[in-house]
């Protein structure tokens, strides 16, 4: 990216922890206003690799509640509605940023944390290992 | 975890913007150390709803680089390797947190932002609308 001069209105950065400790405004700006409101909310049932959603709550994390996908079957649903074990249902995982209260139980101090979440499932052709 | 009285080591919360403006330590703690490093990195090719990955870079955002999935086909790949248009490839989307520099170009001041990203694709049975 192109380097742009430092904004003179930036907060003071003389903190001894700078630049590792920063100020963050928690009033979330939502960039998703023009998206289809339905989004992927019914795909978990209609997919050939359907999944269930499990609620994970951690009050020390921001966001506190994350819904995680767990594939329903090892195989995939075929045209007859049966599970085909020649194919595999696998979770699609993504590394996301969350904020972790640090020190614990503090309302106004956090540390960035990366966690791996399963967002949904997809149907893949298995990797077949042939024995020599 | 067990609730402990509000930690006396919490940063001062007398800021006029409290609790909306918080301190965040950017030294990222990675909770994913025990995960399979391969993860879903080859699923985009092996899926019956394959996708391409597109790089999205924004220097005003943290993380500045996000890889987004775009489904390759409208339909899904069948057992013969052909696209079956009786099924649909659809993106699995997730709302994630990012940090947006605010004011712009400041190294130590951010605002939380929610963005919708496509993580991968799944194959779904289409919703058929019957005309009366």
């Amino acid at each position: 990216g192109i380097t742009i001069p430092r904004n003179p209105g930036c907060p003071n950065s003389e903190d001894k922890n700078f630049p590792r400790t920063v100020m963050v405004n928690l009033n979330i700006h939502n960039r998703n206003t023009n998206t289809n409101p339905k989004r992927s909310s019914d795909y978990y049932n209609r997919s050939t690799s359907p999944w269930n959603l499990h609620r994970n709550e951690d009050p020390e994390r921001y966001p506190s509640v994350i819904w995680e996908a767990k594939c329903r079957h090892l195989g995939c649903i075929n045209a007859d509605g049966n599970v085909d074990y020649h194919m595999n249902s696998v979770p699609i995982q993504q590394e996301i940023l969350v904020l972790r209260r640090e020190p614990p139980h503090c309302p106004n101090s956090f540390r960035l944390e990366k966690i791996l979440v399963s967002v949904g499932c997809t149907c893949v052709t298995p990797i077949v290992h042939h024995v020599a | 975890g067990i609730t402990i009285p509000r930690n006396p080591g919490c940063p001062n919360s007398e800021d006029k913007n409290f609790p909306r403006t918080v301190m965040v330590n950017l030294n990222i703690h990675n909770r994913n150390t025990n995960t399979n490093p391969k993860r879903s990195s080859d699923y985009y090719n092996r899926s019956t709803s394959p996708w391409n990955l597109h790089r999205n870079e924004d220097p005003e955002r943290y993380p500045s680089v996000i890889w987004e999935a775009k489904c390759r086909h409208l339909g899904c790949i069948n057992a013969d390797g052909n696209v079956d248009y009786h099924m649909n490839s659809v993106p699995i989307q997730q709302e994630i947190l990012v940090l947006r520099r605010e004011p712009p170009h400041c190294p130590n001041s951010f605002r939380l932002e929610k963005i919708l990203v496509s993580v991968g694709c799944t194959c779904v049975t289409p919703i058929v609308h019957h005309v009366a």
Epitope: Y44, S64, V65, P107 | -
Partner: antibody, heavy 121, light 107 residues
């Protein structure tokens, strides 16, 4: 102004089903889960389950043994609670309440006005 | 399920009194406690969240404390509008459970 407005009182026969609605306004519907809590006459509060309008995820109190179904319609910002195989002990006031997914510290801050369900033969 | 036991189940007090209501969890694997106030015919109103914090618009005479399995709601100086039923709720262990309630009446 945040509001959760529930549907009106219902009188049902044992064995039938009831569906209570909860229309949300004044906030982004998908940023919050909807939890359902009931209160039998003269009794305490009982958590029934939670629905995430964004993902479609649901989690139920096992006590209800599969009789509860929670759904939501994003297009109308309305959550629904359906209770089947009704029995007399399901006579209660049913409440919806919102719960922030972002910060548990903001849980159950706004409640609907309650819907009275009477089960009687 | 974690049981939340409130004590006392009912309490008579006078305006100006200091009142304490306790809530004990059957195990210590909860994350925190919320406290609610309910008046007859009305929906519950959140008073305290995350064990200690005062909900928006709640007078400072209400306070919360506790850790492990034992939690407390304190009203430092009772006002006429405080006579109601109070419930604790545990967060962090499914299903989320409420205490059986404490009815606070005028002496």
């Amino acid at each position: 102004e945040v509001q959760l407005v529930q549907s009106g009182a219902e009188v049902k026969k044992p064995g039938s089903s009831v569906k209570v609605s909860c229309k949300a306004s004044g906030y982004t519907f998908t940023d919050y889960e909807i939890h359902w809590v009931r209160q039998a006459p003269g009794q305490g509060l009982e958590w029934m389950g939670v629905n995430d309008p964004e993902s479609g995820g649901t989690f139920y109190n096992q006590k209800f043994d599969g009789r509860v179904t929670l759904t939501a319609d994003e297009s109308t910002s309305t959550a629904y609670m359906e209770l089947s195989s009704l029995r007399s002990e399901d006579t209660a006031v049913y409440y919806c309440t919102r719960y922030s997914k972002w910060d548990s510290f903001d849980g159950m801050d706004y409640w609907g006005q309650g819907t009275t369900v009477t089960v009687s033969s | 399920d974690i049981q939340m036991t409130q004590s006392p189940s009912s309490l008579s007090a006078s305006v100006g009194d200091r009142v304490t209501i306790t809530c004990r969890a059957s195990s210590g694997i909860i994350s925190y406690i919320d406290w609610f106030q309910q008046k007859p015919g009305k929906a519950p109103k959140r008073l305290i969240y995350a064990t200690f914090d005062l909900a928006s618009g709640v007078p400072s005479r209400f306070s919360g404390s506790g850790s492990g399995t034992d939690y407390t709601l304190t009203i430092s100086s009772l006002q006429p509008e405080d006579f109601a039923t109070y419930y604790c709720r545990q967060v962090g262990s499914y299903p989320e459970t409420f205490g059986q309630g404490t009815k606070l009446e005028i002496k």
